[in-house]
């Protein structure tokens, strides 16, 4: 079945970077874009960006523009999200989510990766 | 930037009907999608393009969208319907936008 499996939890110090992976299976990886959405503890969903899995084109939420890099590795059907210059407010669960090719909704979600930023 | 406003919480009696609203400027001209998130789990798409249910989502859930308000209605509420519900749209200037979420409690 369609699945998005993410890498494990991370504990990072302020100023560091984190790279989260998301391996897709059960569908043709390049048939859909991949989005990243984060959720701080007890808070709502915050969209971070969208990557085209064929062209590598990316659209970022302006809030993350300067420190977010989204990439894909088509050979392993894996998407990556790297966030740099981490601060305590970046403590959150980071989800990858498949964006339907012909619509702007997220029909399959990864289980999430908890990133804790603490000194 | 485009803003979606949801009620913080909605309470519904077992078996009764709950309606969750999502307000945004001229939201009726956009396609609205809804997600259900249970504690400790990833969100699940429960409604897309205003009123379409993904496979596996019961007919008890229905959606509508017009004017400045979109709604998700849960009929015959069950304990499993509890959790947070988020509306979402795509906007040409803000891209993907989520509402703040509504906590649904079944009593």
């Amino acid at each position: 079945q369609v699945q998005l499996v993410q890498s494990g939890s991370e504990l990072k110090k302020p100023g560091a970077s984190v790279k989260v992976s998301c391996k897709a299976s059960g569908y043709t990886f390049t048939q859909n874009n991949m989005d990243w959405v984060r959720q701080a503890p007890g808070q709502g969903l915050e969209w971070m960006g969208d990557i085209n899995t064929r062209s590598g084109g990316v659209i970022y939420n302006e809030e993350f523009q300067d420190r977010l890099i989204m990439t894909v590795d088509k050979s392993t059907d894996t998407a990556y999200m790297e966030l740099s210059s981490l601060r305590s407010e970046d403590t959150a669960t980071y989800h990858c989510a498949r964006r339907k090719s012909y619509g702007y909704y997220l029909d399959v979600w990864g289980e999430g990766t908890l990133v804790t930023v603490s000194s | 930037s485009y803003v979606l406003t949801q009620p913080v919480s909605v309470s519904v009696a077992l078996g009764q009907t709950a309606t969750i609203t999502c307000e945004g400027e001229q939201i009726g001209s956009k396609e609205v999608h809804w997600y259900h998130q249970r504690p400790g789990q990833a969100p699940i798409l429960v409604m897309f393009r205003d009123a379409r249910r993904p496979s596996g989502i019961p007919e008890r859930l229905s959606g509508s969208n017009s004017g400045n308000t979109a709604s998700l209605t849960i009929s015959g509420a069950e304990a499993g319907d509890e959790g947070d519900y988020y509306c979402q749209v795509w906007d040409s200037s803000s891209y993907t936008v989520f509402g703040g979420g509504t906590k649904v409690t079944v009593v």
């Epitope: 043709t28 048939q31 085209n52 064929r54 062209s55 084109g57 990316v58 012909y102 | 040409s92």
Partner: antibody, heavy 118, light 110 residues
Framework: QSVEESGGRLVTPGTPLTLTCTVS????????MSWVRQAPGKGLEYIGY?????VTYYANWAKGRFTISKTSTTVDLKISSPTTEDTATYFC???????????????WGPGTLVTVSS | AYDMTQTPSFVEAAVGGTVTIKCQAS??????LSWYQQKPGQPPKLLIY???TLASGVSSRFKGSGSGTQFTLTISDLECADAATYYC????????????FGGGTEVVVK
């Protein structure tokens, strides 16, 4: 939402030419844009496209001969050294969905005619 | 190199009839295939995308099918207004492409 090409004219072989596609009603930071040409009485010929981030892709035959670039409201196609075989109507086309990788084009301009002749 | 071969290049059919156009990709393009209609002096018009999804405002007489390398456009209940040239286009890869479009099929309606 629309696109319109301009800059087509009669040029002599070897004279560089830049065509401009002006967009309105949408943002080039959201949509990939393509250039397609059509020689008189011939079929559609894909030239290349530019992603939301400004990365360019070209058909094999077009590499080195054409350069695609963009500003906030325009997409340019530079023909570095036109030959008579470049005589064609040049179309600018927008992807149907955001960040969609040149998948399909639902908005086309009327085209601009380039004639290369000595 | 993801090249597209379209057949036939010309087809003639009567009003009310059916026309079938085929498009073959040199490598698998999944479902990233579109069909366009072009009339003289006009830009192409998107008819079908994702191999089988009808574009907005397009008649259901147009039907797309296929995946991988083999695709078909079927036009049923032909009307005079369907007289045009039809093109397929792959939208999967632009890394190694000679032409994303097929060679075109001219449809004449009698």
């Amino acid at each position: 939402q629309s696109v319109e090409e301009s800059g087509g004219r009669l040029v002599t072989p070897g004279t560089p030419l830049t065509l401009t596609c002006t967009v309105s009603g949408f943002s080039l930071s959201s949509y990939d844009m393509s250039w397609v040409r059509q020689a008189p009485g011939k079929g559609l010929e894909y030239i290349g496209y530019i992603t939301v981030n400004g990365v360019t892709y070209y058909a094999n035959w077009a590499k080195g001969r054409f350069t695609i670039s963009k500003t906030s409201t325009t997409v340019d196609l530079k023909i570095s050294s036109p030959t008579t075989e470049d005589t064609a109507t040049y179309f600018c086309a927008r992807d149907q969905y955001i960040n969609n990788g040149g998948a399909e084009f639902n908005i086309w301009g009327p085209g601009t005619l380039v004639t290369v002749s000595s | 190199a993801y090249d597209m071969t379209q057949t036939p290049s010309f087809v003639e059919a009567a009003v009310g009839g059916t026309v079938t156009i085929k498009c073959q990709a040199s490598e698998s393009i999944s479902s990233w295939l579109s069909w366009y209609q072009q009339k003289p002096g006009q830009p192409p018009k998107l008819l079908i995308y994702q191999a089988s999804t009808l574009a907005s405002g397009v008649s259901s007489r147009f039907k797309g099918s296929g995946s991988g390398t083999q695709f078909t456009l079927t036009i049923s209940d032909l009307e005079c207004a369907d007289a045009a040239t039809y093109y397929c286009q792959q939208g999967y890869s632009y890394g190694d492409v000679d032409n994303a479009f097929g060679g075109g099929t001219e449809v004449v309606v009698k």
